[in-house]
Each structure stands twice: as C-alpha cells, then as structure tokens.
C-alpha cells in the first residue's frame, strides 16, 4: 500500500494509473467504501462522502490513463485509506495528514518560550525535527519546546515530520520581538546634544503599546522616570516628560530621544521598556551616558568623566602632538601647572579613543579658553 503524507490546510494529489492510456471509467472510494468521485464520460461525478466539496480530479490527465484524486484544504480527519477502482483493479493509497502549529502567537518576546505542537492521525507515530534560522536542531514527538528565545531565532523554522520513511516539511515564521541591541553607550562632552536611538529588530504592520525610560543618574540615590510615551500604529506620542532634563522624542519609529545637553548630573544608565499590546512581558534596552568635562582652575588642569565606565578604560591628559602627561584607569586626572598650548583629554579603550575634549591653556598671565 502506497503511503502519502499531507499537510493540514494544504492540497494533495493521490495518483491512480491504468494500463490503457485513454479515458476510461474510474472511481475513488474511502475505506468505508463510500464513493468520493469518478467520471461519467468526460464529466466529473461526485459521491456522498464528507470530502464532497473538497475533492477534485484533473480531466486533462484522464486521456493519459491517469485518474488523480485531489483533496483540498486537508484536515487531520482526512487521514484514511483511499481506493481507486479502474479496469477491475484496485489501487490503495494511505493518506496521513499532519499539522504543526505554534501553540502561542508566532510573535514572541525575547526570552520567552516557543512550543510547537504536532497534530497527527490516530495510530501514527511520527518523529519531528526542527531547524531554527541559526541552524540549531531540536527533536521531539508531539511537542517541541524552545526556551529563552534569542534574536537569532527570528525567521523561518523548518520542521520535518517523518512517518513510514516518508517526510513532510513545515515552515513556520517566528518573529522574536526585541530591540536590535540589548545595551548601548553614548559618550559625550559636556554641553553637547545627546541622541539616544532604540531601533527594533523586527517589523510588523501595526505596532501599538506604551513605553517608559527610567534613569539612574550616577550622582542620584534613586532612579527617576524621564519620559513615558504611547505607540499607536508606529506613531509615537509623549505622555509625560520630566522638566529636568527636558527630553524630546521623535514621532516615528525607530524610537528616538534627544537630550538637549550632556551634563554631569545626567550621566548614568537608563532602561527603556516597551510594553506591546496583547503581549505579556516587556522589551528592554539599556542605555548608558558617559559625560566628559575638561577644566582649568588656577594652576590645575582637570579632566573628569561621569557615568558607567569600565575599569579598563584609560583617561589621559596630553599636550597636542606630545606624549600623555598623565594616564590612569580612573575617572579623573589632572596636571598641575600645565604648560601653555592645546591640551587633549582622552577617554580610550585599548588605544581606541571613545571621547575627546580639548582645552587651550594660555600663558600664565591670561585666562584659559575652552573651544
């Protein structure tokens, strides 16, 4: 008996071939001997089976001695043995219909779990293997679970169902809802405008929800909500914003915030959360602000940074085109009695400059100039 695997909701074509290459009488029946369809001359006739409105054939093949049974919009309960009767012969085909579905929405938040459930006909014992977009293989029986979804899990999951040495392939598109970056750092000189961007790692037709940016300034004892906003069909509207700092927010995606001035009291880290409509849980992105200030007071040239810097970062003070006068893994460095010239304060990581501030030291009889 020939075995054919089908997919729920799909179309399957069961073949039946006569030895004579001409149109002759045929009919298809199910295992209960109920007629599904057949022909009368060059016309299709249908029986009283439950497949009535979903069964069809191809007249164009009849002349070649081929009498297919097409079943559209397959259901699990269509799994059965189908019998083709032609030329006093009987051809049997066993059809097994499988369905594979994500038991939750296919749009999942980063860190959530994905469960795939296999629907199969009674008496079948299929095995399932799924391959994620990043090439990770998972195997299982009736259910497959993947916990802690990551951004790289977004895309098409290809699942193969194996039964009787035959296979049927399912493709399920999964969208992991997350920000493109989990964390980012912005380095700014005091007084500069600061731009924070929170690009999403997915695109959907309609995006609705609400969000908030909480800020923990390095100098403050507790965190504070800087801004709250709503998102409606990808349009951003501010609900509430603090007076200090007075943040501005872009009206369109990607989420974009502007801080008019980088000041030491703002240096610190923030957490932007986004709650999406009809989703449990929130998307998070951490953002950090490091602010640099270079000053000269009397005979002391000082460079300071505020905000979350890693211990391996180097802070240096150097006269232009000369070796660094002072270089430390600290958040403040100074030079006493600096000679005249253009001094550079540099924050660097393994030789790569992250932030630079210049200050002009004038001869001792004049006042310093900060460009």
């Amino acid at each position: 008996k020939k075995v054919v695997l089908g997919k729920k909701g799909d179309t399957v074509e069961l073949t039946c071939t006569a030895s004579q290459k001409k149109s002759i009488q045929f009919h298809w029946k199910n295992s209960n001997q109920i007629k599904i369809l057949g022909n009368q001359g060059s016309f299709l006739t249908k029986g009283p089976s439950k497949l009535n409105d979903r069964a069809d054939s191809r007249r164009s093949l009849w002349d070649q001695g081929n009498f297919p049974l097409i079943i559209k919009n397959l259901k699990i309960e269509d799994s059965d043995t189908y019998i083709c009767e032609v030329e006093d012969q009987k051809e049997e085909v066993q059809l097994l219909v499988f369905g594979l579905t994500a038991n939750s929405d296919t749009h999942l938040l980063q860190g959530q779990s994905l469960t795939l459930t296999l629907e199969s006909p009674p008496g079948s014992s299929p095995s399932v293997q799924c391959r994620s977009p990043r090439g990770k293989n998972i195997q299982g029986g009736k259910t497959l679970s993947v916990s802690q979804l990551e951004l790289q899990d977004s895309g098409t999951w290809t699942c193969t169902v194996l039964q009787n040495q035959k296979k049927v392939e399912f493709k399920i598109d999964i969208v992991v809802l997350a920000f493109q970056k989990a964390s980012s750092i912005v380095y700014k000189k005091e007084g500069e405008q600061v731009e924070f961007s929170f690009p999403l790692a997915f695109t959907v037709e309609k995006l609705t929800g609400s969000g908030e940016l909480w800020w923990q300034a390095e100098r403050a004892s507790s965190s504070k909500s800087w801004i709250t906003f709503d998102l409606k069909n990808k349009e951003v509207s501010v609900k509430r914003v603090t007076q200090d700092p007075k943040l501005q927010m872009g009206k369109k995606l990607p989420l974009h915030l502007t801080l008019p001035q980088a000041l030491p009291q703002y240096a610190g880290s923030g957490n932007l959360t986004l709650a999406l409509e009809a989703k449990t849980g929130k998307l998070h992105q951490e953002v950090n602000l490091v602010v640099m200030r270079a000053t000269q007071l009397q005979k002391n040239l000082t460079c300071e940074v505020w905000g979350p810097t890693s211990p391996k970062l180097m802070l240096s003070l150097k006269l232009e085109n000369k070796e660094a006068k002072v270089s430390k893994r600290e958040k403040a460095v100074w030079v006493l009695n600096p000679e005249a010239g253009m001094w550079q304060c540099l924050l660097s990581d393994s030789g790569q400059v992250l932030l630079e501030s210049n200050i002009k030291v004038l001869p001792t009889w004049s006042t310093p100039v900060q460009p």
Partner: antibody
C-alpha cells in the same frame, strides 16, 4: 501570499537555448502544477505545457514537443523551462503560472511577472 | 486543437458603459472556460472560471455566461481601471488555448 518570481530578460542567438526560472513561495511547492504560457510582442497567449513539482511529471503542447524541457528543484522551490533551437519567432514574454483545479478543469490562478526572451542574430 | 475566437478584437467605451465581449469555441467545451484581464506590461489576471464563477477578489461588475460553444464576458459599469485586454481560455482539452484577445479602450 502566493508569489512566482521569474528570472531576468535574456537575449539569445538563433539556434541557442534559453533557460528561464520561476521561484515559488507562499504555498507548498509540491502541491500545485506550474504551467508555462508565452506571449509574442503584441500577440495573444500560448500555452506551452505543465510540470507537476511533486514528481517532476510533465506534459508539453505538441507544438513544443522535442524543444521544451521543464524541470524543478524542490530544495529551492524553483521550476525551470528550457527552450532549445531558438528561432526569431520564439521572441516573447514567457510566464509561469500556478494552476487551480475546479470541477476537474485547470485554470491559471497565479502568474509570474514574465521574462522577456529576445532571439536575434 | 480547439480554436477560440473573440469578438470584437477591439472596442471603445466610456466609464459607466455596459460592455459585452464574446468568445466562440470551435467545438463544445461545456463550461470549461476562463476569462483573464491583462494590462500593458503586466501578467494576465484570472477574472472568471467555469464560464460564470467569479474569482475571489474580482469586482462583481464582472460576470460571465454561456456553455457549449458560445460565451460572454460582461462588465456592467465600466471603471477607469477596466481598460485592458481580455482573453478567454478553454480548459476542456489539451492544449489549452486562448482567444486572440479583445482590447478595451477609452472612448
């Protein structure tokens, strides 16, 4: 949604062969026959044949028998139509189309965007 | 091969007009007939199949009738987007054949 995306325009010399591809998406590739239909400039439509992507079975119009070959690659959900011994009258836009079957008859429900094949010396 | 003949081969009409295109088969094809619309530089689009069944998504101003050898496509009230070329096609016997087309132009 069902999409059939065809390969780009080709210019060929008489006597040469051309191979046009048609990549299907949005449906189970092996479940529907793909037909090829051509249209000469300013002319009507002409059916060339079909391929059953499930088993690779083909049926060609008598007119193209011996000159046309239809193949498929299930791993990429792509169907190919190769026409050999090209002549100037083969200059046409070649379309692939996915059929639908209703009451045992076949109709062309979804079409590719077409591929212009120009045969010129 | 079954020959399909359309008439007229071209037709001028105005928005709001009722238009009828006919298609004749060289032999009985029962109701195994389809109508397609094609706009310049585009692929054909299935409008009607089985002589009178409207394909999903096609406006109800399009209708088809006939059986045997004579068929008609009617557009009850022409819209600007309906100006195109229309083809009939028989699905009775291989090779499937098309009519030569009817070009519908704005008057």
């Amino acid at each position: 949604q069902v999409q059939l995306v065809q390969s780009g325009a080709e210019v060929k010399k008489p006597g040469a062969s051309v191979k046009v591809s048609c990549k299907a998406s949005g449906h189970t590739f092996t479940s529907y026959y793909i037909h090829w239909v051509r249209q000469a400039p300013g002319q009507g439509l002409e059916w060339m044949g079909w391929i059953n992507p499930n088993n690779g079975g083909t049926h060609y119009a008598q007119k193209f028998q011996g000159r046309v070959t239809m193949t498929r690659d299930t791993s990429t959900s792509t169907v190919y139509m190769e026409l050999s011994s090209l002549r100037s009258e083969d200059t046409a836009v070649y379309y692939c189309a996915r059929d639908m079957v209703r009451d045992s008859a076949e109709y062309f429900q979804h079409w590719g965007q077409g591929t212009l094949v120009t045969v010129s010396s | 091969d079954i020959q399909m003949t359309q008439s007229p081969s071209s037709l001028s009409a105005s928005v709001g007009d009722r238009v009828t295109i006919t298609c004749r088969a060289s032999e009985d094809i029962s109701t195994y007939l389809a109508w397609y619309q094609q706009k310049p530089g585009k692929a054909p689009k299935l409008l009607i199949y089985a002589a009178s069944t409207l394909q999903s998504g096609v406006p109800s101003r399009f209708s088809g009738s006939g059986s045997g050898t004579d068929f008609t496509l009617t557009i009850s009230s022409l819209q600007p987007e309906d100006f195109a070329t229309y083809y009939c096609q028989q699905s009775h016997t291989i090779p499937w054949t098309f009519g030569q087309g009817t070009r519908l132009e704005i008057k």
